[in-house]
Interface confidence: low
């Protein structure tokens, strides 16, 4: 607020007033009259810069007159009362209301006294974030999308992630005139390692007390990544039953597991149980390459493992045996 003057009547008002689109706002404006000063106010006038005529007038005997009577109202000025408060309420704020306004007091004997006020019209945006479900492409693609709808001024969107990635941000006019919808895409080369990880969209706007954080859980669709575990290169005759596991990571989940060997179907000592393969005890050495083929909605992938059951030294107890 400007400091009051000394020895003269002074109009007091903030230099800037914020208001929200569609809401009402009061443009405060007061005449400060020093104790020893005598003044007679005959009119209060509001005018908008760049427009001819007044948008609102309060006349000492005629009362209030408004350029748009449905949208304007003197808050405190009353007929028969001293006109010291010219504060004006504006209803149903529109984008085009943003601008500079002059509040003017017509006084005697001091003459006219005025002040300028900048009305800033804001619109609070609505924010959403969503995953962009992708497949392995080998190229950078949008993996997350953050949208700030109907902000005025436009919201600022940033991304926070340990995964790298690049933002691609664009703006289009919002549904309400003068508002802006900001869309930001988070772009990265999809990989299975990214699937299920989080990225955070941060939306900043002057209507927010603090930035809004929206978390997106990434989704990458990829065919199975397959490996076989459970073999330690140390199997001997006389050993108990063993189990091999076909480990598959995929999105969506695997729909089927198929065990075979490079020679064709499984030998009698190997029994498939879904993702697991039961190796029964054998009485003679073997050297077989096993294959696990895993299928999901995107395709099939396989892993191979060569298993050897060796003759061990008689003194050792390890090995595959019938017990």
């Amino acid at each position: 607020w400007p400091p009051p003057g000394t020895g003269d009547v002074v109009v007091q008002a903030p230099t800037q007033v914020p208001g929200f689109l569609g809401d009402s706002v009061t443009l405060p404006c007061y005449l400060q009259v020093p104790n020893m000063e005598v003044t007679h106010v005959s009119q209060l006038t509001w005018a908008r810069h760049g427009e001819s005529g007044s948008m609102a007038v309060f006349h000492q005997t005629q009362g209030p007159s408004y350029s748009e009577s449905k949208r304007l109202e003197f808050v405190a000025a009353r007929l028969g009362a001293e006109l010291r408060n010219a504060s004006l309420r504006m209803f149903g704020l529109r984008v085009e209301d943003e601008g500079n306004y002059t509040c003017l007091f017509v006084t005697f004997p001091q003459g006219s006294r005025s002040v300028d006020i900048w009305l800033r019209v804001l619109a609070k945006p609505q924010n959403t974030a969503e995953v962009q479900k992708v497949q392995l492409t080998g190229e950078p693609v949008p993996m997350a999308r953050c949208v700030s709808t109907g902000g005025r001024p436009p919201a600022q969107i940033t991304w926070h992630s340990d995964l790298g990635g690049m933002p691609n941000t664009s703006q289009v006019p919002g549904f309400l005139s003068g508002t802006v919808t900001v869309t930001s895409l988070w772009i990265l080369v999809p990989s299975s390692q990214v699937d299920g990880k989080n990225v955070t969209c941060k939306v900043e706007h002057e209507s927010f007390e603090k930035p809004q954080l929206l978390t997106v859980n990434l989704t990458v669709y990829y065919p199975p990544e397959v490996s076989i575990s459970g073999y330690d290169n140390n199997w001997y005759l006389g050993q108990n039953e063993a189990t091999l596991t076909c480990d598959a990571r995929s999105n969506p989940e695997p729909t089927g597991y198929n065990w075979s060997t490079t020679m064709g179907p499984l030998p009698p000592f190997a029994v498939a149980q879904g993702a697991q393969l039961l190796i029964r005890p054998v009485d003679k050495p073997i050297n077989t390459t096993l294959i696990c083929n895993v299928t999901n909605a995107l395709g099939a992938r396989q892993a191979e493992l060569t298993v050897q059951v060796k003759e061990g030294p008689p003194s050792e107890h390890s090995g595959i045996s019938r017990n």
Partner: antibody, heavy 116, light 107 residues
Framework: EVQLVQSGSELKKPGASVKISCKTS????????MHWVRQPHGKGLEWIGG????????SYNQRFKGRVTLTVDKSTSTAYMELSSLRSEDTAVYYC?????????WGQGTLVTVSS | DIQMTQSPSAMSASVGDRVTITCKAS??????VAWYQQKPGQPPKALIY???YRYSGVPDRFSGSGSGTDFTLTISSLQAEDLAEYFC?????????FGQGTKLEIK
């Protein structure tokens, strides 16, 4: 339902006065300014003035200043217009109209005939 | 006083026609113009306020446009019940003033 019901037709001699009433219902009388507009037969509309029932503040067309008096009775939600020093050219239908910048509701009109 | 000059003063049109009535203010009145319809023996009825805003209940064939000094009332497809006189009014400054009216007849 908003209604503005005016008093009946008047026949007056030149130099006399006429007082027309406008009884309102269906809304809060003190929240809207009441204005008066007249229309000579077959001619256009002419704004006379307005009064705010709550403050009593008035605004008059200079053409009628000194001859017209606008008053209200808040207890009966009624507005009045008195026009004095009548002349033949005051012959017209007089309307009360609720003001919203423009005039959103009008009375049915009161015919005032000034004739010797 | 601001003069509101309306044209034409009278016109005849057929049902289904597009009708345009204009109003010119002697000085800038912003968008502070209203349009009224007055049928014989009745008070005026508000159609349009603030130059281009239709009152609720007013058929959407009525539309208003303009700002500053030049204003237009358009009836997109004339109906028989639109037989009436139409007035513009400025409410930018006192005294409020009306156009002289346009009498619309149906052919």
């Amino acid at each position: 339902e908003v209604q503005l019901v005016q008093s009946g037709s008047e026949l007056k001699k030149p130099g006399a006065s006429v007082k027309i009433s406008c009884k309102t219902s269906g809304y809060t009388f003190t929240e809207y300014t009441m204005h008066w507009v007249r229309q000579p037969h077959g001619k256009g509309l002419e704004w006379i003035g307005g009064i705010h029932p709550n403050s009593g503040g008035t605004s008059y067309n200079q053409r009628f200043k000194g001859r017209v008096t606008l008053t209200v009775d808040k207890s009966t939600s009624t507005a009045y217009m008195e026009l004095s020093s009548l002349r033949s050219e005051d012959t017209a239908v007089y309307y009360c109209a609720r003001w919203t910048g423009d005039f959103d509701y009008w009375g049915q009109g009161t015919l005032v005939t000034v004739s010797s | 006083d601001i003069q509101m000059t309306q044209s034409p003063s009278a016109m005849s049109a057929s049902v289904g026609d597009r009708v345009t009535i204009t109003c010119k203010a002697s000085q800038n009145v912003g968008t502070n113009v209203a349009w009224y319809q007055q049928k014989p023996g009745q008070p005026p009825k508000a159609l349009i306020y603030s130059a281009s805003y239709r009152y609720s209940g007013v058929p959407d064939r009525f539309s208003g446009s303009g700002s500053g000094t030049d204003f237009t009332l358009t009836i997109s497809s004339l109906q028989a019940e639109d037989l009436a006189e139409y007035f513009c009014q400025q409410y930018q400054s006192y005294p409020y003033t009306f156009g002289q009216g346009t009498k619309l007849e149906i052919k």
